[in-house]
C-alpha cells in the first residue's frame, strides 16, 4: 500500500534527484503546522511570518495586529501570552532550556491600553513558570521554586510558598521525575475556571538520591550537575497538593487536599489535577505499584473553608493484566453537570475505550467499542463529544477525528475526517475553540501536512490555514522513497510494519535492510505520517530498505499486545523485531548478509539486545543513548512496567535483562555505541557500563560520545551524529562513499 500520494513525474528523469544527507541536516524539507491560539469561541491569535501578533475573528473575517513585531523585538521576545481580559500581554525572552519541558525566561508585561510596558513591581528574573488567571489579569508565577501571585500586573507580588529550595523543595513546578515521567509539563499549578482558587503541587526531593555528572564547558574545571533522580527502587519524591484562595490569600492560607486513604497507605504518586468548577476539583493519584489509580472529586466547603473529598466520590481504576492506563492514566473530561465525566480506559475485551461515569466506575456506560482504540477526548460540549481513534479501515497507525452526538438518543457517531482528503490525510489532531464553535484540523500525513479551519456545528471547512505549498514545490524534483504500511500475522500476533523502499525499488533485486526500532511500552512507530528524515535519505540516495515494526508492548492495538511485556522488558520487543526480519528475508528482496538495526533511547536498548541475540541475523547496529539496565533508569517509568528491583518482586528479571549480561554475544557484530555525556534522562552511566562489559569480555566495538550533550544530541552534534552513523552503515553495507 503506497501511502505517499503519487506525483506527476517529470518526463526528464535527470531533473529528479535523490535526497542528500545535507537536505536532512539543513531541514530543507521540513513542514509547518498551524495551531490557532484560541482566545474565544470565534477568535484566535497567530504569530505572523513577520512576527506581528495578529487577532483573527472568524465570524467577521477581520484581523488586526494586537502587538507589533517592533514591540516584540524591543525585548527580544520569542513568545507571548494575552491576558483573558485582553488588557495585558506577557512577553517572554531569554529562553533557557532546562529539561524536556522546563525552561526559565525573562518576562515583561505590556499594557495594551496605553501601549507601554508596565513599570514598577517588575517581575524577577529568571522565572521558572508564569501564567495568567483564566479570567481577568491575575498572574501566578514560580521564581526560585516558590509561587507568587499578583492581583494585577503592576501590583506587588504576594508570596504563597516560602520553603522552595533548589533540588530540595519544588512548588508549582515538577521535579525531574515528575516532569519527565508523570506530568509531562513544566508546571505543577492549576487555576480554577474563574480564577478564584489556585491549586499547586509541592514536591519534596530531600531524601532522593542524586545523579551527578560532569559538565565540561570551557572552564579549567568541569562543573558538576546534580539532579535528584530516583532510579528504580530508590526513594521517591513526596508530593502534597495545596489550594489557596487567590482573592484574599493572606487570610486562610494554603489548604492541603487530603490523599485518599487507600492511596496514602503506601508510597504513591499524584498524577493530575482537573478543575471542574471553581468549587470542585478532581485529583488523580496512583500507587507506587502502578496498577491502582484513584480519581478523587473534592468540593470546597465554604463554611469550613476546606476541601472535602468524600469516599463516595473516589473512583478506582485497577489493572489486573498490566499497569493502570496506557503510557499515563487517562484524565477525565467532565460534562456540563459538573459531576459525571468521560474517560478512556480498558473495556472487558481489553481495548481502551471511552466510558461515561455518572456514579461509580462499575456502572460506567461504554461509549465506544470495537477491536480498535479511542486515543484522545478533545472536547465535550452539551451535545457533542469529539475524540480521535484508529478505528477507520482497521489501521492502528492512523488517527481520525470523530463526533458523537451525546445530546440525542441513541448517540450517533460521525467520522469528521475520514473522507476529507483520504489519500493525503490519515493522521489528524484537532484544536477546538471555546464551546467547540470552531476547530482546526492538523493533518500530519501520509501526504504533505495541511491545517484547516472548520465550523464546529456543521464540520464544514472554512479555510486552509497552512498547506505547505513551498514544501510541495520543493519536493517536485525529489525522488522520495516509497512507503508502505502492512502487517504480518505471526503466532496469533499481528505485527504492523512500515517499509521505506528506494525510489526505483525492484522486487527481483536484493537490498540492504535497516531496522529502525523504538519499541518502548505504549509507543507506536508505524504511523501514517509524513516525514523526510534520515531514513528517507538512506532509502532515496543509498538504496537501503528501512523497516519499522510495532511488536509486543506497543500501543493502540489492545491490552493483549500492550501488556505482553509487563514485568518482562527486553524479551518480546526483541523477539518481535527478529521475527519480522525473518519474514522480510522471506519476501525475497533483502540481502540477508546486509542487515542492520538501530535505535535511540529505548530503541538503543532493543537494538543492543537484538544485536546480542545470537541469531546471526544482524551484521551491524547502532545504539544511541541506550538504557543498559533498568536499575539505572527512573523509578516512575521503570517500575510501571517492571515492578521493583527487590528479591521478593522482580529483581531477577532486572538482572537478566541488562545489555551487559550479553556482552559476549557482541563478538560477531559491528556495534556502534553513542551517548551524550550530559544526558539527564538516560544517564551516560548506561553506555559506560556497556563499554566496560565489552572491554572486560575483550569484544571490539566502536563508540562516540558527545561532550555536554543531553538525550536529544541537538545542534551541531546532530549533524555529526547522522554523518557518523551514515559512514558506519555504508561501511557495514559495503556502499561506496
Amino acid at each position: 500500500i503506497v501511502l505517499r500520494p503519487s506525483r506527476v513525474h517529470n518526463s526528464e528523469e535527470n531533473t529528479m534527484r535523490a535526497l542528500t544527507l545535507k537536505d536532512i541536516l539543513n531541514g530543507t524539507f521540513s513542514y509547518k503546522t498551524f495551531f490557532p491560539n484560541w482566545i474565544s469561541g470565534q477568535e484566535y491569535l497567530h504569530q505572523s511570518a513577520d512576527n506581528n501578533i495578529v487577532l483573527y475573528n472568524i465570524e467577521t473575517g477581520q484581523s488586526y495586529t494586537i502587538l507589533s513585531n517592533r514591540t516584540m523585538k524591543s525585548v527580544n521576545a520569542s513568545n507571548y501570552g494575552l491576558s483573558p481580559d485582553r488588557q495585558f500581554v506577557y512577553l517572554e525572552s531569554d529562553y533557557s532550556k532546562l529539561w524536556r519541558y522546563s525552561y526559565t525566561a525573562t518576562y515583561y508585561i505590556y499594557d495594551l491600553s496605553n501601549g507601554e510596558f508596565v513599570r514598577g513591581n517588575e517581575l524577577p528574573r529568571p522565572i521558572q513558570y508564569l501564567c495568567w488567571s483564566p479570567v481577568g489579569s491575575k498572574l501566578a508565577y514560580v521564581y526560585q521554586n516558590n509561587i507568587y501571585l499578583k492581583q494585577r500586573p503592576g501590583d506587588p507580588p504576594f508570596q504563597i510558598t516560602f520553603n522552595g529550595r533548589e533540588n530540595k523543595i519544588f512548588n508549582g513546578i515538577p521535579d525531574w521525575v515528575y516532569e519527565e515521567e508523570m506530568l509531562a509539563t513544566k508546571y505543577a499549578l492549576w487555576w480554577s475556571p474563574n480564577g478564584k482558587f489556585l491549586a499547586y503541587a509541592e514536591f519534596n526531593d530531600t531524601d532522593i538520591p542524586v545523579i551527578a555528572y560532569s559538565y565540561y564547558g570551557d572552564e579549567q574545571y568541569p562543573r558538576t550537575i546534580n539532579i535528584p533522580y530516583p532510579k528504580a527502587g530508590a526513594k521517591n519524591p513526596v508530593v502534597r497538593i495545596f489550594i489557596i484562595d487567590t482573592t484574599y490569600p493572606a487570610y486562610v492560607g494554603p489548604q492541603e487536599v487530603p490523599v485518599p486513604a487507600m492511596i496514602a497507605s503506601s508510597d504513591y504518586y499524584f498524577s493530575w489535577l482537573t478543575w471542574v468548577t471553581d468549587e470542585r476539583v478532581c485529583l488523580q493519584w496512583l500507587k507506587r505499584v502502578q496498577n491502582v489509580s484513584v480519581l478523587s472529586i473534592c468540593d470546597f466547603r465554604e463554611d469550613w473553608q476546606t476541601w472535602d473529598c468524600p469516599k463516595t466520590q473516589e473512583h478506582i481504576e485497577e489493572s489486573r493484566t498490566g499497569w493502570a492506563g496506557g503510557f499515563f492514566v487517562s484524565t477525565p473530561v467532565f460534562s456540563y453537570d459538573a459531576i459525571s465525566y468521560y474517560k478512556i480506559f480498558s473495556d472487558k475485551d481489553g481495548y481502551k475505550h471511552i466510558h461515561y461515569i455518572k456514579d461509580t466506575v462499575e456502572n460506567a456506560i461504554q461509549i465506544t467499542s470495537g477491536k480498535w482504540e479511542a486515543i484522545n477526548i478533545f472536547r465535550v460540549t452539551q451535545d457533542s463529544l469529539f475524540y480521535s481513534s484508529n478505528e477507520f479501515e482497521e489501521y492502528p497507525g492512523r488517527r481520525n477525528i470523530y463526533r458523537i452526538s451525546i445530546g440525542s438518543y441513541p448517540p450517533s457517531k460521525k467520522c469528521v475526517t475520514c473522507h476529507l482528503r483520504k489519500e493525503r490525510c490519515q493522521y489528524y489532531t484537532a484544536s477546538f475553540s471555546d464551546y467547540a464553535k470552531y476547530y482546526a484540523l492538523v493533518c500530519y500525513g501520509p501526504g504533505i501536512p495541511i491545517s484547516t479551519l472548520h465550523d464546529g456545528r456543521t464540520d464544514q471547512e472554512i479555510k486552509i490555514l497552512e498547506e505547505n505549498k513551498e514544501l510541495e514545490n520543493a519536493l517536485k524534483n525529489i525522488q522520495l522513497p516509497k512507503e508502505e504500511i502492512k502487517k504480518l500475522e505471526v503466532d496469533e500476533i499481528t505485527l504492523w510494519y512500515k517499509m521505506i523502499l528506494p525510489p526505483q525499488f525492484d522486487r527481483s533485486k536484493k537490498y540492504p535492510l535497516l531496522i529502525q526500532v523504538y519499541g518502548g511500552p505504549c509507543s507506536q512507530s508505524v504511523r501514517s505520517v509524513f516525514a523526510v528524515n534520515w531514513i528517507s535519505y538512506l532509502a532515496s540516495k543509498e538504496g537501503m530498505v528501512i523497516a519499522l515494526v510495532d511488536g509486543r508492548g506497543t500501543a493502540f492495538q489492545g491490552d493483549k499486545l500492550l501488556y505482553a511485556v509487563y514485568r518482562k522488558l527486553g524479551v518480546y520487543e526483541v523477539e518481535d523485531q527478529i521475527t519480522a526480519v525473518r519474514k522480510f528475508i522471506e519476501m525475497g528482496f533483502i540481502d540477508e548478509k546486509r542487515i542492520a538495526i538501530w535505535g535511540w533511547s529505548y530503541g538503543g536498548y532493543v537494538s543492543s539486545l537484538a544485536l546480542a541475540s545470537g541469531t546471526g541475523l544482524f551484521k551491524c547496529g547502532i545504539a544511541v543513548a541506550p538504557v543498559s539496565s533498568w536499575e539505572y533508569y527512573a523509578s516512575v517509568y521503570t517500575e510501571r512496567f517492571m515492578g521493583l528491583p527487590t528479591k521478593d518482586d522482580n529483581l531477577e528479571h532486572y538482572k537478566n535483562s541488562t545489555v551487559m549480561a550479553r556482552a559476549e554475544y557482541f563478538r560477531n557484530v559491528d556495534y556502534l555505541l553513542i551517548h551524550g555525556t550530559a544526558d539527564d534522562n538516560v544517564h551516560f552511566q548506561n553506555s559506560a557500563q556497556i563499554a566496560k562489559a565489552l572491554v572486560n569480555a575483550q569484544v571490539d566495538f566502536q563508540a562516540m560520545w558527545y561532550s555536554d550533550q543531553n538525550h536529544g544530541l541537538s545542534g551541531l552534534s546532530t549533524n555529526h551524529l547522522y554523518t557518523h552513523m551514515t559512514h558506519f552503515l555504508k561501511q557495514c553495507f559495503s556502499l561506496s562513499d
Epitope: G120, N121, Q151, D155, P156, P157, F158, Q159, T161, F162, N163, E202, R240, F242, T247, Y248, A250, Y251, V252, G253, P254, Q255, E256, R301, D303, W304, Q305, T306
Partner: antibody
Framework: EVQLLESGGGLVQPGGSLRLSCAAS????????MSWVRQAPGKGLEWVSA????????YYADSVKGRFTISRDNSKNTLYLQMNSLRAEDTAVYYC??????????WGQGTLVTVSS | EIVLTQSPGTLSLSPGERATLSCRAS???????LAWYQQKPGQAPRLLIN???RRATGIPDRFSGSGSGTDFTLTISRLEPEDFAVYYC?????????FGQGTKVEIK
C-alpha cells in the same frame, strides 16, 4: 461562638523554655491557618509565627527563628508555641490569632510571658 | 520587611467628629493585603477592616477603609464613645507580616 484560649505563660529565666497552648473552639480549627502575635508591655503588635491548616508549613519572624517552634494538633483543636533560649526581649503578652498573614479575625485574650532573672 | 508608618501618633477628637487615620507603607502593598485593628487597654486586638477593604463581621458601617499602593486610610465617620482606642494597620503581602506602630484616638 469562636473562642481562643491561651495558656502556659509565666515567669522564666533567660535561656529557659516555655510551651504556650491555644485551645480553639467554635470553628473548624483544622481548616484554618493560625498565628501567634505578641505585644511587649506598652508597645505595639509583632507577628511571631504562623502555621497552615494541615501543619505542613510553618513561618517565623527573624527575631525568633531557630528558637521558637509552632505546631498544632488538629485532633485536639490546639495550637502550640514551643519557646526555647528565651531572652528578656521576648517578654510580652502572646496572643493566638486565627489567620495566616493577615485579616486576623479572632484573637485570644493573651498570656503573659516574662523573661527575667 | 515592609515598614508601616501610622500618623498621627495621637488623634484628639470629640465624640461625633470624623477621624481620619493614615497608614503609609515603605513599599507597595495594595488593599487586598491591608487590614485595620482596634485595641482597647487590657484587651486583645479586634479586626475592623479585613484585607480587601471589607468591614469585618459585626463592625458598624461608620468604619471604612480605603487606599491603594502605599497610602491607606481608616475613616471613622462619627466617633462614638466606645471608639476611643489604639488603631493598628497591618500588611500581609510580605513575610513577615508587620503592624504599624499604632494611632491612639483619645477624647479631646
Amino acid at each position: 461562638e469562636v473562642q481562643l484560649l491561651e495558656s502556659g505563660g509565666g515567669l522564666v529565666q533567660p535561656g529557659g523554655s516555655l510551651r504556650l497552648s491555644c485551645a480553639a473552639s467554635g470553628f473548624t480549627f483544622s481548616s484554618y491557618a493560625m498565628s501567634w502575635v505578641r505585644q511587649a508591655p506598652g508597645k505595639g503588635l509583632e507577628w511571631v509565627s504562623a502555621i497552615i491548616s494541615s501543619g505542613a508549613s510553618t513561618y517565623y519572624a527573624d527575631s525568633v527563628k531557630g528558637r521558637f517552634t509552632i505546631s498544632r494538633d488538629n485532633s485536639k483543636n490546639t495550637l502550640y508555641l514551643q519557646m526555647n533560649s528565651l531572652r528578656a526581649e521576648d517578654t510580652a503578652v502572646y496572643y493566638c490569632a486565627k489567620g495566616w498573614f493577615g485579616g486576623f479575625n479572632y484573637w485570644g485574650q493573651g498570656t503573659l510571658v516574662t523573661v527575667s532573672s | 520587611e515592609i515598614v508601616l508608618t501610622q500618623s498621627p501618633g495621637t488623634l484628639s477628637l470629640s465624640p461625633g467628629e470624623r477621624a481620619t487615620l493614615s497608614c503609609r507603607a515603605s513599599q507597595s502593598v495594595t488593599s487586598s493585603y491591608l487590614a485595620w485593628y482596634q485595641q482597647k487597654p487590657g484587651q486583645a486586638p479586634r479586626l475592623l477592616i479585613n484585607v480587601g477593604s471589607r468591614r469585618a463581621t459585626g463592625i458598624p458601617d461608620r468604619f471604612s477603609g480605603s487606599g491603594s499602593g502605599t497610602d491607606f486610610t481608616l475613616t471613622i465617620s462619627r466617633l462614638e464613645p466606645e471608639d476611643f482606642a489604639v488603631y493598628y494597620c497591618q500588611q500581609g503581602i510580605m513575610l513577615p507580616p508587620t503592624f504599624g506602630q499604632g494611632t491612639k484616638v483619645e477624647i479631646k
